[in-house]
Each structure stands twice: as structure tokens, then as C-alpha cells.
Interface confidence: low
């Protein structure tokens, strides 16, 4: 039978040292339905948009694979220059193409990003800034 699209975030948690790059993995199991992927930190109405495949400027974020390829199903991202302020749970969310607006279709289970300070002084300094 045709499988309904699933959004797989294989890593429940990721630990990254401050100043390094975090890789957040996300894979869709199907090309259907067509529509963009967005990444958010947190859930609910107050969630923070981290990356939008369709539009926007996200200078710290790069994609692991070429999302412009129409048969791409890998939506993993890298976030550079991680600080303690980046800690949180990140969700990979598939949208279904719609008019006038795309509609949220399915979310991954989330990946918790933890940030390890290079040293305690550095950690406190970054938290205060």
C-alpha cells in the first residue's frame, strides 16, 4: 500500500560545543505531498522559525543536500556558530502546497539541541550576552 509521508528526525538529541556547527537531521519518506519543509525551534504558536525552504534569509543555516532537486527527500540542516542561546528542541515540519498559503502537513518528533560550553567562564559570559 502507498505509505503516507512520514517526517523522520532520527536523533532525539544532539550535543554540540559552543562555537561549533550543529547538524539536525530530517528525512521525508515520500515525495507526496508536494510542499516545502520548515524548521522551527519549539512548538506551538510561539515557535521560532529557523529555516524556510521556500523563502527568507537564514545566514547561519545551510542545507546538507540540494533542496532545489525536485526528488530530494533529505531536509537536514546545519546551524553554524552555536551558542547556549540556541539550545532547545528543533522540529522539521513538512507543509503541503496550498493556495494562497501552504498548510502544515506533518512534523517530525523533534531533536533536542544541547550546547556544551568550552569552559564555564565562557558559558556564563555567553548566557549574559
Amino acid at each position: 500500500l502507498e505509505e503516507e509521508l512520514q517526517v523522520i528526525q532520527p536523533d532525539k538529541s544532539v550535543l554540540v560545543a559552543a562555537g561549533e556547527t550543529a547538524t539536525l537531521r530530517c528525512t521525508a519518506t515520500s515525495l507526496i505531498p508536494v510542499g516545502p519543509i520548515q524548521w522551527f525551534r519549539g512548538a506551538g504558536p510561539g515557535r521560532e522559525l529557523i529555516y524556510n525552504q521556500k523563502e527568507g534569509h537564514f545566514p547561519r543555516v545551510t542545507t546538507v543536500s540540494d533542496l532545489t532537486k525536485r526528488n530530494n527527500m533529505d531536509f537536514s540542516i546545519r546551524i553554524g556558530n552555536i551558542t547556549p542561546a540556541d539550545a532547545g528542541t528543533y522540529y522539521c515540519v513538512k507543509f503541503r502546497k496550498g493556495s494562497p498559503d501552504d498548510v502544515e502537513f506533518k512534523s517530525g518528533a523533534g531533536t533536542e539541541l544541547s550546547v556544551r560550553a568550552k569552559d564555564l567562564c565562557n558559558f556564563n559570559e555567553q548566557l549574559e550576552n
Epitope: 500500500l1 502507498e2 515520500s30 515525495l31 507526496i32 508536494v34 532537486k69 525536485r70 526528488n71
Partner: nanobody, 118 residues
């Protein structure tokens, strides 16, 4: 081996209608999502829309409200009903199982040519 045969294309005036058919063989049609795509001369492949195994549909914004995708599982056939055709709809239309594909080489069908002109 997956076989897809598209038919129903032709020359139509702006504002006219056409119905395209896609006859499928070699896979479980009734259990598969199916899509339509099109390619205008000298341009890349553009996804048009898709129909799921349960009959629900999704469309490219530019054709929504004008095009309707349907399927007849007993005949292993998918249809694309096109109304209010515009010159920019002129293209070779292809069908494919599942989702969007990279290029027309991923289709086993030859496509069917639609020309919208007065």
C-alpha cells in the same frame, strides 16, 4: 515494468477545455499516488498536481480551480480535466506514479502534447 500511456492532447483555443488520460500498467495502480507534470518547449519540467490512493488531490497554484485530476481504479487510468486553458498551458503533459520527479527521463510515457492557440 511500469508502463504509462498518455493521450487526449491536441490543439485548443484559449478558454477551451481538454481531458487527458493516463493508462497505467505494471504496478499496483489503485494503491499508488499519481501525478501529472508538464514540460513546455525549452523549459524544465513543472509539476501540475497529484491524486492520492483515496482520491484526494493537490494542485500547483497556477492550475488550481481550472484543472481537475481524477482516477478510475477499475480501468487503471488517471485523468486530467483542463478548463479555461491559456497559451501558457501549452506543453507536453506526462503522468507518473508517486511524486515529483527530477526530469522527463523518469517517465516511461511519451507524454501528450497540448497546444493552446487561436
Amino acid at each position: 515494468h511500469v508502463q504509462l500511456v498518455e493521450s487526449g492532447g491536441g490543439l485548443v483555443q484559449p478558454g477551451g477545455s481538454l481531458r487527458l488520460s493516463c493508462a497505467a500498467r505494471g504496478f499496483s495502480f489503485r494503491d499508488s499516488a499519481m501525478s501529472w507534470a508538464r514540460q513546455a518547449p525549452g523549459k524544465g519540467l513543472e509539476w501540475v498536481g497529484a491524486i492520492y490512493s483515496d482520491g484526494s488531490t493537490v494542485y500547483e497554484k497556477s492550475v488550481k480551480g481550472r484543472f481537475t485530476i481524477s482516477r478510475d481504479n477499475a480501468k487503471n487510468t488517471m485523468y486530467l480535466q483542463m478548463h479555461s486553458l491559456k497559451p501558457e498551458d501549452s506543453a507536453r503533459y506526462y503522468c507518473a506514479p508517486k511524486g515529483v520527479v527530477a526530469d522527463e527521463g523518469d517517465y516511461s510515457g511519451q507524454g501528450t502534447l497540448v497546444t493552446v492557440s487561436s
